[in-house]
Amino acid sequence: FGISGKHFITVTTFTSAGNIGEDGTLSCTFEPDIKLNGIVIQWLKEGIKGLVHEFKEGKDDLSQQHEMFRGRTAVFADQVVVGNASLRLKNVQLTDAGTYTCYIRTSKGKGNANLEYKTGAFSMPEINVDYNASSESLRCEAPRWFPQPTVAWASQVDQGANFSEVSNTSFELNSENVTMKVVSVLYNVTINNTYSCMIENDIAKATGDIKVTDSEVKRRSQLQLLNS
């Protein structure tokens, strides 16, 4: 926390991750102050001259905003009085990664806190039975990842087994030349078993499960952000 002036207020931030091309939120909260006109919120980014965003006297003031954030930022204006200084960030870019400072001034005092913002790409995998293959196989696809992730397969029946010899993973660059499509095929699968395709980089971990029986195919997928 940075302390200046006679009083300091508690400002809290949370490390978070942004998905390239999507919208993100940089979270920041502070001790509420019912006097909206007396609240100043400034977001700054390490290594960038100018501001990321400024909100004061009940409205935005972007006269000092750095051009890389032009048209991409907003606070949740109706939530400022209850202590929410979080920043909405439109169309997250790889270059948005870095250390941000949320600086607050209210009638009660001043305070600030830093947060680390990671950027990359992550998406849910989808597993399907590949009927075109010569033997029963599973195809795990996830449309957008960056940096390049690792892909691993697991099975409920063969716990601890290494499937690297019976799987093939490829990475195809997407049209924007940053993110990549992940495709992994697992060969020689057996019926009545649950298989998992796990995709992970330093930002996120995603898992897709598929259970194949004689009568049905059940799928489930989940995604979790790491270190946030």
């Epitope: 935005d60 930022t73 169309n91």
Partner: antibody, heavy 121, light 107 residues
Framework: QLQLQESGPGLVKPSETLSLTCTAS??????????WSWIRQHPGKGLEWIGN???????YYNPSLKSRVTMSVDTSKNQFSLKLSSVTAADTAVYYC?????????????WGRGTLVTVSS | DIQMTQSPSSVSASVGDRVTITCRAS??????LAWYQQKPGKAPKLLIY???SLQSGVPSRFSGSGSGTDFTLTISSLQPEDFATYYC?????????FGGGTKVEIK
């Protein structure tokens, strides 16, 4: 409520500079929550975003027109302006000024009536 | 630049009809899409923002949906005053770009 009105010559000669002004009434363009844009529409055609300006004077121009466009703002007169240099017949269009609905939304919730500018000798 | 492709370019319909216009972005734009209505000799009017949010004062027969690359504007029951040209616009990435327009004509 805020209204926008474009003004400027309706006829410009080729190679000269097109100059338009947008005057706001019923509200202030110094409100920090908005960007102010210029958009044009060629006769019978679609819409083209030219660029925007903030009350502080910072600008962003469409790269396709960037070399020829200059925008400025005069908060004391509650006006913002567009200059487009080295015009050709292809710049003949209805020119609109508009307000972006917030600092992040980039949709246009308020428009001027538009002014037809013809480029001809 | 992000290309916005509207279809159809024109549609003939009658009062009371349900009309659907689609807009496709050349790359993902999340939900940053607006729809406008323009009548001859007039400025465009904002109908829908953020893909599905109805602009204040716009009748509820207008609705928008979609995210990513594919979006739809629906007029649930066409009224005489709805005959106009409709444009989509992406608000995701500079430079902001518009679709080519869809003219809704009287059948």
């Amino acid at each position: 409520q805020l209204q926008l009105q474009e003004s400027g010559p309706g006829l410009v000669k080729p190679s000269e500079t097109l100059s338009l002004t947008c005057t706001a009434s019923g509200g202030s363009i110094s409100h920090g929550g908005y960007y102010w844009s210029w958009i044009r529409q060629h006769p019978g055609k679609g819409l083209e975003w030219i660029g925007n300006i903030y009350y502080s004077g910072s600008t962003y121009y469409n790269p396709s027109l960037k070399s020829r466009v200059t925008m400025s703002v005069d908060t004391s007169k509650n006006q913002f302006s567009l200059k487009l240099s080295s015009v050709t017949a292809a710049d003949t269009a209805v020119y609109y000024c508009a307000r972006e609905s917030s600092t992040i939304s980039a949709d246009f919730d308020l428009w001027g009536r538009g002014t037809l500018v013809t480029v001809s000798s | 630049d992000i290309q916005m492709t509207q279809s159809p370019s024109s549609v003939s319909a009658s009062v009371g009809d349900r009309v659907t216009i689609t807009c496709r972005a050349s790359q993902g734009i999340s939900r940053w899409l607006a729809w406008y209505q323009q009548k001859p000799g007039k400025a465009p009017k904002l109908l829908i923002y953020a893909a599905s949010s109805l602009q204040s004062g716009v009748p509820s027969r207008f609705s928008g949906s979609g995210s990513g690359t594919d979006f739809t504007l629906t007029i649930s029951s066409l009224q005489p005053e709805d005959f106009a040209t409709y444009y989509c616009q992406q608000a995701h990435t500079f430079p902001y770009t518009f679709g080519g327009g869809t003219k809704v004509e009287i059948k």
